[in-house]
Amino acid sequence: TLNSVLNSNAIKNLPPPLGGAAGHPGSAVSAAPGILYPGGNKYQTIDNYQPYPCAEDEECGTDEYCASPTRGGDAGVQICLACRKRRKRCMRHAMCCPGNYCKNGICVSSDQNNFRGEIEETITESFGNDHSTLDGYSRRTTLSSKMYHSKGQEGSVCLRSSDCATGLCCARHFWSKICKPVLKEGQVCTKHRRKGSHGLEIFQRCYCGEGLSCRIQKDHHQASNSSRLHTCQRH
């Protein structure tokens, strides 16, 4: 299981990659099929990790959720699946695409209008701790004084990227998810070789900013497959 993977000491040390996600010291570059993660400032990998592409939603991209690929399939085999659009069936918030949430088994829009007079507990308690400043989510007791909160700033706990301020995304960080900066041109990014190969990134990076894509750095073409460095580059 991923638990045993994470807690395993049968790992090899690797030098840290060049740069970090928006300067974060512990932003490992996933080199599928291995898993990279930092232990302190020591980067480590577990080779040939295949069995479980994901174990929870946090490992997947912002437009994905973690689930069994087939209905009634083996619950142990889960991969990152594309998020569900508005009016599609769902079982939890993470299944719905950004800007939507799961209500009564259906993905519905989470724009502010939907919340006026309709603040339900599954939303308010899932997202509504005031300090994490999630837009439009508020406890019943604070409705009169504070209907809307500002978006989460860098370092704030979040559940998805729409909880974070402009220029930030919601990314895995240890056993939580926090708002981190969207990557700028030239910054190291994580390129997932295929859907579901996200692996375990303790310090997950954000995606590249608008007009940028995560591509192999020119001078790294000669490097071996597993150590190619990807950076955010103009289209």
């Epitope: 991923l2 638990n3 960080h173 303790i202």
Partner: antibody, heavy 115, light 108 residues
Framework: QVQLVESGGGLVQPGGSLRLSCAAS????????MTWVRQAPGKGLEWVSG????????YYADSVKGRFTISRDNSKNTLYLQMNSLRAEDTAVYYC????????WGQGTLVTVSS | DIVLTQSPATLSLSPGERATLSCRAS???????LAWYQQKPGQAPRLLIY???NRATGVPARFSGSGSGTDFTLTISSLEPEDFATYYC?????????FGQGTKVEIK
């Protein structure tokens, strides 16, 4: 409102075991990572362990690795810390707290390891 | 491990005075993944600041956090009687999570 209530502390001999529990209420438990922090008498705070919302990922301080096990039962909204091979230096008040910066804390439960 | 050193160890001030508490990291934190807590005797800690400068729910405006890199500061603009306590900083940017040793703010 958010509430965290620890239990299970007490006096135990060196080498013994204890299981701490933390009952959570007032929020959607499985959406949040949880943390154990301890404080030895008259000392500062020390991070002990953390667990992700689904329970898939667990993290430990070097001082407790291999002896302590963090777990959670999301159906019961409860966080656990199984402590084995206890040492005198594990004597402390143990707090459960929510998420990575601890926005809500329990009142703490005292664990005393002594012969 | 990132070591957080808080100074001074004890700060003796009078109500109404300004308190400036320092937290210095042994390595660059790169990102503002730093929190501040207040703890009174016999009580659990209380979150004051997260993300280096964001005030937690219900925390009075007299508390503010600032800093980046290796140097972070908690400022209490005008001390109230209930502010006399021990304050801890905590970094959550790198593994393992670490706390400073604390600064005790006492009445002069």
């Amino acid at each position: 409102q958010v509430q965290l209530v620890e239990s299970g502390g007490g006096l135990v001999q060196p080498g013994g075991s204890l299981r701490l529990s933390c009952a959570a209420s007032g929020f959607t438990f499985n959406n949040y990572g949880m943390t154990w922090v301890r404080q030895a008498p008259g000392k500062g705070l020390e991070w002990v362990s953390g667990i992700s919302g689904s329970g898939s990922y667990t993290y430990y301080a070097d001082s407790v690795k291999g002896r302590f096990t963090i777990s959670r039962d999301n159906s019961k909204n409860t966080l656990y810390l199984q402590m084995n091979s206890l040492r005198a230096e594990d004597t402390a008040v143990y707090y459960c707290a929510r998420t990575i910066y601890m926005d809500y804390w329990g009142q703490g439960t005292l664990v005393t390891v002594s012969s | 491990d990132i070591v957080l050193t808080q100074s001074p160890a004890t700060l003796s001030l009078s109500p109404g005075e300004r308190a400036t508490l320092s937290c210095r990291a042994s390595q660059n934190l790169f990102s503002p993944y730093l929190a501040w807590y207040q703890q009174k005797p016999g009580q659990a800690p209380r979150l004051l600041i997260y993300g280096a400068s964001n005030r937690a729910t219900g925390v009075p405006a007299r508390f503010s956090g600032s800093g980046s890199g290796t140097d972070f500061t908690l400022t209490i603009s005008s001390l109230e009687p209930e502010d006399f306590a021990t304050y801890y900083c905590q970094q959550y940017g790198d593994e393992p999570i670490t706390f400073g040793q604390g600064t005790k703010v006492e009445i002069k």
